[in-house]
């Protein structure tokens, strides 16, 4: 079941999530001067069966001067810094260390994909909350939200999570000593 | 809470202009395209077009292409469809849809009448 | 553009029986199908996405299933409240299409 809305926003901080559930949409969502091709899903999806789970649909890039019933109106001010390189081998990483029945792991890029990713998550999903470059986290409990269904109505747990600023970055998803490396894996995962 | 809130209703003269807006809370606006819906007793539902707000990207259905013409403020969390040259046929009840058509506005009913 | 047929306009059912809603998409679609309910004076509300997966708050007894050509939408234990008009959607090709919806009548 579809989560209603998007987690929760903490100030200087990004989420991530190590794996998503079954029945989870990615947007196919492209750079500037791209959009998605006129054929196929508007989002790919995590589907499979209890012991295997992949992306379906893939997501296409087409130039957007090639289609004469697309336009592109007064473009809007970039709002999102380019994914760093770094920040991928990171989720990467992320994803190459669990294989959970029932999840999909972060999908490759595609071609000409936008720079920040979004995704439609469904109910029980975590997602693991850092801090930005030249912010430390204070906790007061776990770094992550979940989506939860409650008097059948979804929402998300907030993060008990504080971006202070700082110069050093703080460890994903989160503990108490900040590391320049934010490859860490909650103990919890596993398990979930 | 998603919600898209549209007026609920328009009264307008044939030949003129109508411009309607949805009004969007409760997620990143920017992020998801907004689609356009038409309803007409007999006719069902018809996809007019959408708009991306963030990417400013916007797709019509051939058939709509002249009558609608679709904006998006960041600023306000707003779209707009603005149908021109109004006739008998435009009387319909108009929906935008957003989240990869989860969330639907109340429509708003448009009427065209001399 | 890719047609929608829901053959069967209006379907009557009783309370606590099973109904199958039917669309058929005039070419592949894979499974880039969404069904929807709208009940009198209401706008429509999203039931299934991906031809199979609920939105929340959808009861269980809404089941989803098809891919390709053929759809199905089937309400199991049908309640009073399931009374309304239901509509599949392709969205595999621009320009997305509708089915011409389905009328479910209680008797």
């Known amino acids: 079941e579809l989560c209603d809305d998007d987690p929760p926003k903490i100030t200087h901080a990004t989420f991530k999530a190590v794996a998503y559930k079954e029945g989870t949409m990615l947007n196919c969502e492209c750079k500037r001067g791209f959009r998605r091709i006129k054929s196929g899903s508007p989002y790919m999806l995590c589907t499979g069966n209890s012991s295997h789970s992949s992306w379906d649909n893939q997501c296409q890039c087409t130039s957007s001067a090639a289609r004469n019933t697309t336009k592109q109106v007064t473009p809007q001010p970039e709002e999102q810094k380019e994914r760093k390189t770094t920040e991928m081998q990171s989720q990467m990483q992320l994803a190459d260390q669990v294989s959970l029945p029932g999840h999909c792991r972060e999908p490759p890029p595609w071609e000409n994909e936008a720079t920040e990713r979004i995704y439609h998550f469904v109910v029980g999903q975590t997602v693991y909350y850092q801090c930005v470059q030249g912010y430390r986290a204070l906790h007061r409990g776990p770094a992550e939200s979940v989506c939860k269904m409650t008097h059948g109505k979804t929402r998300w747990t907030q993060p008990q999570l504080i971006c202070t600023g700082e110069t050093e970055p703080s460890q994903f998803p989160g503990e108490e000593e900040p590391q320049a490396s934010p490859d860490g894996l909650p103990e919890s995962e596993t398990s979930r | 809470q998603v919600q898209l809130q549209q007026p609920g209703a328009e009264l307008v003269r044939p030949g003129t202009s109508v411009k309607m807006s949805c009004k969007a809370a409760g997620y990143t606006f920017s992020n998801y395209w907004i689609g356009w819906v038409k309803q007409r007793p007999g006719h069902g539902l018809e996809w007019i077009g959408d708009?991306?707000?963030?990417?400013?990207?916007?797709n019509y259905n051939e058939k709509f292409t002249g009558k609608a013409t679709l904006t998006a403020d960041t600023s306000s969390s707003t779209a707009y469809m603005q149908l021109s040259s109004l006739t008998s046929e435009d009387s319909a009840i108009y929906y935008c849809v957003s989240r990869n058509f989860a969330n639907w506005g109340q429509g708003t009913l448009v009427t065209v009448s001399a | 553009d890719i047609q929608m047929t829901q053959s069967q306009k209006f379907m009557s059912t009783s309370v606590g029986d099973r109904v199958s809603v039917t669309c058929k998409a005039s070419?592949?679609?894979?499974?880039?199908v969404a069904w929807y309910q709208q009940k009198p004076g209401q706008s429509p509300k999203a039931l299934i996405y991906?031809?199979?997966y609920r939105y929340s708050g959808v009861p269980d007894r809404f089941t989803g299933s098809g891919s390709g050509t053929d759809f199905t939408l089937t309400i199991s234990n049908v309640q009073s409240e399931d009374l309304a008009e239901y509509f599949c959607q392709q969205y595999n090709s621009y320009p997305w299409t509708f089915g011409g919806g389905t009328k479910l009548e209680i008797k």
């Open positions: 991906s031809a199979s």
């Open positions: 708009i991306h707000p963030g990417g400013g990207y916007i």
């Open positions: 070419q592949n679609v894979g499974t880039n």
